[in-house]
């Protein structure tokens, strides 16, 4: 496939990545699927600088990111290592809270109103952010 050298329309370029910010809400799995269909992934936060950039664009609104522990360990959707990577949890989080009454604990991470992270029920309809890297081979066939 061809390499993507500029961001699609309505996406924001930052540090060799493209970001798309939703204005509606979806469950985490649906948001994840939306990004995949756009040849992207839910945002993976790898630095304080990227955290500030995303935070600036989403404002004080609960917003899904590409981090979950639905199969046990916390995992970033693009394979970035959680253990050694950037983290920005709110104090006392993640807490896998069961008191919401929706069944099970909390397995999906989101930006809270102050930008720091919380784990929550994956079915909640939050906004989301998609990310794709520039210079990544796209799925489209090259133009002949």
């Amino acid at each position: 496939g061809s390499e993507r050298t500029c961001c699609p329309v309505n996406w924001v370029e930052h540090e060799r990545s493209c970001y798309w910010f939703s204005r509606s809400g979806k469950a985490w799995a649906d948001a994840d699927n939306y990004c995949r269909l756009e040849d992207a992934h839910l945002v993976v936060v790898t630095s304080w600088e990227e955290q500030k950039f995303v935070q600036h664009h989403i404002g004080p609104v609960n917003t899904w990111m590409g981090l979950h522990d639905q199969n046990g360990p916390w995992k970033w959707v693009d394979g970035t290592d959680y253990e050694t990577g950037f983290k920005n949890w709110r104090p006392e989080q993640p807490d896998d809270w069961y008191g919401h009454g929706l069944g099970g604990g909390e397995d999906c991470a989101h930006f809270t109103d102050d930008g720091r992270w919380n784990d929550d029920v994956c079915q909640r309809p939050y906004r989301w952010v998609c990310e794709t890297e520039l210079d990544k081979a796209s799925q489209e066939p090259p133009l002949l």
Epitope: D69, N71, G72, Y82, W89, P94, D96, G105
Partner: antibody, heavy 114, light 107 residues
Framework: EVQLVESGGGLVKPGGSLRLSCAAS????????MIWVRQAPGKGLEWVSS????????YYADSVKGRFTISRDNAKNSLYLQMNSLRAEDTAVYYC???????WGQGTLVTVSS | DIQMTQSPSSLSASVGDRVTITCRAS??????LGWYQQKPGKAPKRLIY???NLQSGVPSRFSGSGSGTEFTLTISSLQPEDFATYYC?????????FGQGTKVEIK
Amino acid sequence: EVQLVESGGGLVKPGGSLRLSCAASGFTFSSYSMIWVRQAPGKGLEWVSSISGTSSYIYYADSVKGRFTISRDNAKNSLYLQMNSLRAEDTAVYYCAGMTTVIWGQGTLVTVSS
Amino acid sequence: DIQMTQSPSSLSASVGDRVTITCRASQDIRNILGWYQQKPGKAPKRLIYAASNLQSGVPSRFSGSGSGTEFTLTISSLQPEDFATYYCLQYNSYPWTFGQGTKVEIK
């Protein structure tokens, strides 16, 4: 390597106390709830207690409530189970587990007998 | 508290057989259920999470299905290393509860 290692089991008289420890390594301990599960000799598995990553939420099985206390020290990557007023029916192998039961320790045997 | 009723309590099967184990919850637990394999003297090992998702590293001959109150673990073609005891666990709400176990023995 992600690992849990229990210790502290042994023989104790009815009414006695014991403190089990579970040492975690290879993962960000504070990011995960942890649990204790036990298995009496020749019997099935029984959930005993859970504690959230920063100890905000703690839960106990009715069979141990008021006698057992779960705690953790994230600075030491350690989980604990303080067991008081032990009874014969508490005799079991005690396992610690984490990552929603993906990782388990090898178990430590607690025997309550006079 | 939610009761988990597992059946059968034991079964005899041969290598290559298709094996099915059932777990019934006393109330709706959505899909918040796991399946575990335990061999003598060893800690349990999670095979399935969220009723139907295969834990990474677990052979694809294991599968889970169900939602609400009825759940099934299927081993499509039993292998020698699969002879063990299997447990279901509901983690939908506290207290978490295990089924009583199903021992799979060699016929």
